[in-house]
């Protein structure tokens, strides 16, 4: 009387269950008169010896690939014994590979965290994710881990990490690399500083005067305000630094308290005041300019 | 497939502009990076830069920054390179040519875009 | 910039024949992660550079296995065992390791 081990699917992919079935054709008994078991490579699975003829592999790995069979025992303790089975457990290659950013966009604010969000789109077993950092890679991070998702994460984002990173996903069968993603870290800008630039130490009534405020940190563009005793005189936009510059005509009424602020969208800051007086001399002298 | 269509020939006065365009298909054009490339004629190959066309991000050869200025169009799935103050040593074919990070090499080029300076 | 020197500049062989060309960098080009970004192409006559080897030693799909590359640090060697018509052209070394990326002035292999 021949066992036979009945394997489905007889191809399985890693990760799918198995069910394994010990058949007994040319016997018409009972299975209840017969324990079974079931063995890869010389050793018996699951529970071993049951009453059972059936036993499902929940999740069959790469690793579980061998040489399976089954053995019945009769109640005169009678061992049966089926022909060996060879099941190779199919890896799907990791296909389709993408990098997503937490935030989503890959914009962050400087000291907020940042979450790289490696994927695939299929990809079975042991996945070892990779983390790269600029278009020539430096390795920031390798894991390996049986799931389609990984994450690298930068707890605090700082400036420097402003640049462009990949992931790359590999489980035996060559590395696949996502598409870039670029981080932009998002300043909120430092608090200006306001100079004054005449064209003479001693400027005059006519002069034209030059504002110029610039916050030394901050993402751009900067839109940066003037202000004389709180009243706005304009504003200037700086899209790529250097701060931005507001020329002013002098007349008499100009003495008092200037300002500026800077705001780029993230939060305004204002500078702090440069007092210019003008002492209104006697005579055919001229107003005379200090700060 | 993988494609990088160039734009035509180019016959330019000195001091004048032009712009050279590069037209990808067949893949994500925000993955990668566009990179250009000169070649004087009988002579040699020279890198410029490249542009990433997820953000615009750009990065120059010193000895072509101010005279080109690259850029990228993502609906349109197409990088230019802006030259400007044309003089007879910026005749030459430009190629574009489509960076495979991680690997690290210029997989796909454009069929190269020629130009020629003529007063 | 990293001057990249190609040895010869003229290449007269017979089909058949076994060649090397070489590529000295004029500084290391070793990249700070370890790599050497060394690679090497082929231009024929009115047509855009086509990659044959990068890393130094890898060789791209579809590039026949005739096609092999060596070296490390300053020294590079591209080898042709058995050249074919079709390996007729201009060939390039190219460093990706320090900006500005540099390529050698090339190599024209020609029939004798």
């Known amino acids: 009387a021949g066992l036979l081990l009945i394997v489905s699917p007889s191809h399985p992919t890693e990760g799918s269950p198995v069910n394994l079935t010990c058949k007994m054709p040319s016997l018409q008994s009972s299975d209840a008169q017969f324990q079974f078991c079931f063995f890869r490579d010389d050793q018996a699975l699951g529970p071993g010896w049951s009453s059972s003829p059936k036993l499902q592999i929940a999740n069959m790995w790469k690793e579980d690939s061998g040489s399976y069979w089954c053995e019945a025992q009769t109640m005169a303790s009678k061992v049966l014994r089926s022909w060996r089975s060879q099941i190779n457990v199919h890896r799907v290659p990791v296909a389709d590979v993408s990098l997503e950013t937490q935030p989503p966009g890959g914009q962050v604010m400087e000291g907020d965290r940042l979450v790289l969000i490696c994927s695939v789109a299929m990809g079975t077993g042991d996945i070892t994710f990779l983390w790269y950092k600029g278009a020539i890679g430096l390795n920031l991070q390798t894991k390996t881990q049986r799931s389609l998702t990984a994450e690298y994460e930068i707890p605090t984002a700082r400036e420097s990490d402003a640049e462009q990173y990949y992931c790359v996903a590999e489980n035996g069968y060559g590395p696949r690399p996502s598409g870039l993603v670029s981080i932009t870290v998002r300043i909120p800008v430092s608090r200006p500083i306001l100079m004054v630039r005449a064209p003479r130490a001693q400027a005059v009534v006519g002069d034209v005067l030059k504002l110029h405020c610039e916050a030394l940190r901050g993402s751009h563009p900067i839109l940066y305000w003037f202000y004389h005793e709180d009243v706005i005189l304009g504003s200037s936009s700086a899209p790529s630094g250097g701060g931005a510059s507001f020329n002013l005509s002098l007349t008499a009424e100009h003495s008092g308290n200037y300002s500026c602020e800077a705001n780029n969208g993230l939060g305004a800051q204002r500078s702090e005041e440069v007092t210019l007086n003008f002492t209104v001399p006697t005579g055919a002298r001229s107003n005379h300019l200090t700060s | 497939q993988v494609q990088l269509q160039q734009s035509g020939p180019e016959l330019v006065k000195p001091g004048a502009s032009v712009r050279i365009s590069c037209k990808a298909s067949?893949?994500?054009?925000?993955?990668?990076?566009i990179h250009w490339v000169k070649q004087r004629p009988g002579q040699g190959l020279e890198w410029i830069g490249w542009?990433?066309?997820?953000?615009?991000?750009?990065k120059y050869n010193e000895k072509f920054k101010g005279k080109t200025t690259l850029t990228a169009d993502k609906s349109s799935s197409t990088a230019y390179m802006q030259l400007s103050s044309l003089t007879s040593e910026d005749s030459a074919v430009y190629f574009c040519?489509?960076?495979?990070?991680?690997?690290?090499?210029?997989?796909?080029w454009g069929q190269g875009t020629t130009l020629t300076l003529s007063s | 910039d990293v001057l990249m020197t190609q040895t010869p500049l003229s290449l007269p062989v017979s089909l058949g024949d076994q060649v090397s060309i070489s590529c000295r960098s004029g500084q290391t080009i070793v990249h700070s992660n370890g790599n050497t970004y060394l690679e090497w192409y082929l231009q024929k006559p009115g047509q855009s550079p086509k990659l044959l080897i990068y890393k130094v030693s890898n060789r791209f799909s579809g590039v026949p296995d005739r096609f092999s590359g060596s070296g490390s640090g300053t020294d590079f060697t591209l080898r042709i065992s058995r050249v074919e018509a079709e390996d007729l052209g201009v060939y390039y070394c190219f460093q990706g390791s320090h900006v500005p990326w540099t390529f050698g002035g090339g190599t024209k292999l020609e029939i004798k």
């Open positions: 067949g893949y994500t054009f925000t993955s990668y990076n």
């Open positions: 040519a489509r960076r495979i990070h991680y690997f690290d090499y210029f997989d796909y």
């Open positions: 542009i990433y066309p997820g953000d615009g991000n750009t």
